[in-house]
Amino acid sequence: EVEKTACPSGKKAREIDESLIFYKKWELEACVDAALLATQMDRVNAIPFTYEQLDVLKHKLDELYPQGYPESVIQHLGYLFLKMSPEDIRKWNVTSLETLKALLEVNKGHEMSPQVATLIDRFVKGRGQLDKDTLDTLTAFYPGYLCSLSPEELSSVPPSSIWAVRPQDLDTCDPRQLDVLYPKARLAFQNMNGSEYFVKIQSFLGGAPTEDLKALSQQNVSMDLATFMKLRTDAVLPLTVAEVQKLLGPHVEGLKAEERHRPVRDWILRQRQDDLDTLGLGLQGGIPNGYLVLDLSMQEALS
């Protein structure tokens, strides 16, 4: 082992204080006791150490805790967290939501780093499920967090946690994710009355099946076009012109602007032209009058 340089006389640190910002790297290494550092970690964040000095402090903690830091140290890492690698973080056992919040605060305003992703993964796995408080915290720091999870991971979200989800949290979710989230949302909001229910469920409707959309069409919900355009194409196709008209209410005229885009384009192709004409929007491409519509999926099922 390389012989360590001795601490110069009078420079041994008795506490973690601002005098240490004037220590050279080798002096920090020689004069700061790792155990002292661990017990006074909460001071480190209040002192403007350079990145090079933080490297030294991290090294001292690594030597003291080769199996991973205890939560009492993790909670007070502050900017030292930015020095941690995903490998370091995999050694941790983080159970306190306060610790998670403290570390997310350090990374606030930045993209989710590999360190943060690993931290969240460790935390959620430790808890066993994505409970409401955790989801609340994660989506507050990272609105896109929910949509970064796989459908399998989303399946561990309990319906009660859905209350914490804001519309913007679902902006980047794909249909497979909404397929998982929608039934949970339906369950979570089931006791709400019509208009309140629609406000809450609206963001999740990209995962709704046809029968639920039909039911909504009977409730005067006035769905906006942006929401309609995010619906599953296979759920929209079986809706009748009358059902779509009721579903959209005054927003129905927006169909004209979207007639070349899915799911509107595909839905138009499935409707009788004379039914489309009743909307008075000039929608073209429906099935000409007198043509017989065969439900091929039904035919295949019978044969």
């Epitope: 420079k11 005098s19 403007p48």
Partner: antibody, heavy 116, light 110 residues
Framework: EVQLLESGGGLVQPGGSLRLSCAAS????????MSWVRQAPGKGLEWVSG????????YYADSVRGRFTVSRDNSKNTLYLQMNSLRAEDTAVYYC?????????WGQGTLVTVSS | QSVLTQPPSASGTPGQRVTISCTGS????????VSWYQQLPGTAPKLLIY???KRPSGVPDRFSGSKSGTSASLAISGLRSEDEADYYC???????????FGGGTKVTVL
């Protein structure tokens, strides 16, 4: 016991000069940054200057930059403030304080009066 | 005009809790630690709170400090007559490259 003892204050005419000293004891002076803070009569605290242990960088308030110079002699455990081109608004009690980010020990202060 | 903003005065009766606010910006309180100083009449200032919430030895636990974002506050619980003094907040300012104080808050015990 940490002690800071200022000296050198007094009455000086506008445009004149004065040199304040602060003798430190009870701690390893050469390890710590030091600062000067002043307080005009009946007013609040105003930071004047700061100097790290090795005198590498020196920091000044805009109100004194170019007129005041901070220095230290670690072998004598003493902090200095050379004040030139003094103005009436420099009239204040001048304190020396240990550290630069949180002043954990203060001297009793020395009064500087700039008046004709 | 001080860089950090404090209320000029605060008061309370003995035993009450008094809170003093200190508002700064993203160049001082935001990234840096806040300290609080007590100045009794006719004496030099004394450090009361450092590193946002730490108390030096000898300072009663009736005094507590906290920081959130670009603001900080000092709370005095169980107010006593000997707490009548001027209280200053302070922080390093990264843009000014210097230390800044609040204008001070005079605490009166009624």
């Amino acid at each position: 016991e940490v002690q800071l003892l200022e000296s050198g204050g007094g009455l000086v005419q506008p445009g004149g000069s004065l040199r304040l000293s602060c003798a430190a004891s009870g701690f390893t002076f050469s390890n710590y940054a030091m600062s000067w803070v002043r307080q005009a009569p009946g007013k609040g605290l105003e930071w004047v200057s700061g100097i790290p242990p090795d005198s590498g960088s020196k920091y000044y308030a805009d109100s004194v930059r170019g007129r005041f110079t901070v220095s230290r002699d670690n072998s004598k455990n003493t902090l200095y403030l050379q004040m030139n081109s003094l103005r009436a608004e420099d009239t204040a009690v001048y304190y020396c304080a240990k550290n630069m980010l949180s002043f954990d020990y203060w001297g009793q202060g020395t009064l500087v009066t700039v008046s004709s | 005009q001080s860089v950090l903003t404090q209320p000029p005065s605060a008061s309370g009766t003995p035993g009450q809790r008094v809170t003093i606010s200190c508002t700064g910006s993203s160049s001082n309180i935001g990234p840096n630690a806040v300290s609080w100083y007590q100045q009794l009449p006719g004496t030099a200032p004394k450090l009361l709170i450092y590193y946002n919430s730490k108390r030096p030895s000898g300072v009663p636990d009736r005094f507590s400090g906290s920081k959130s974002g670009t603001s900080a506050s000092l709370a005095i619980s169980g107010l006593r007559s000997e707490d009548e003094a001027d209280y200053y907040c302070g922080s390093w300012d990264s843009d000014l490259r210097g230390y800044v104080f609040g204008g001070g808050t005079k605490v009166t015990v009624l």
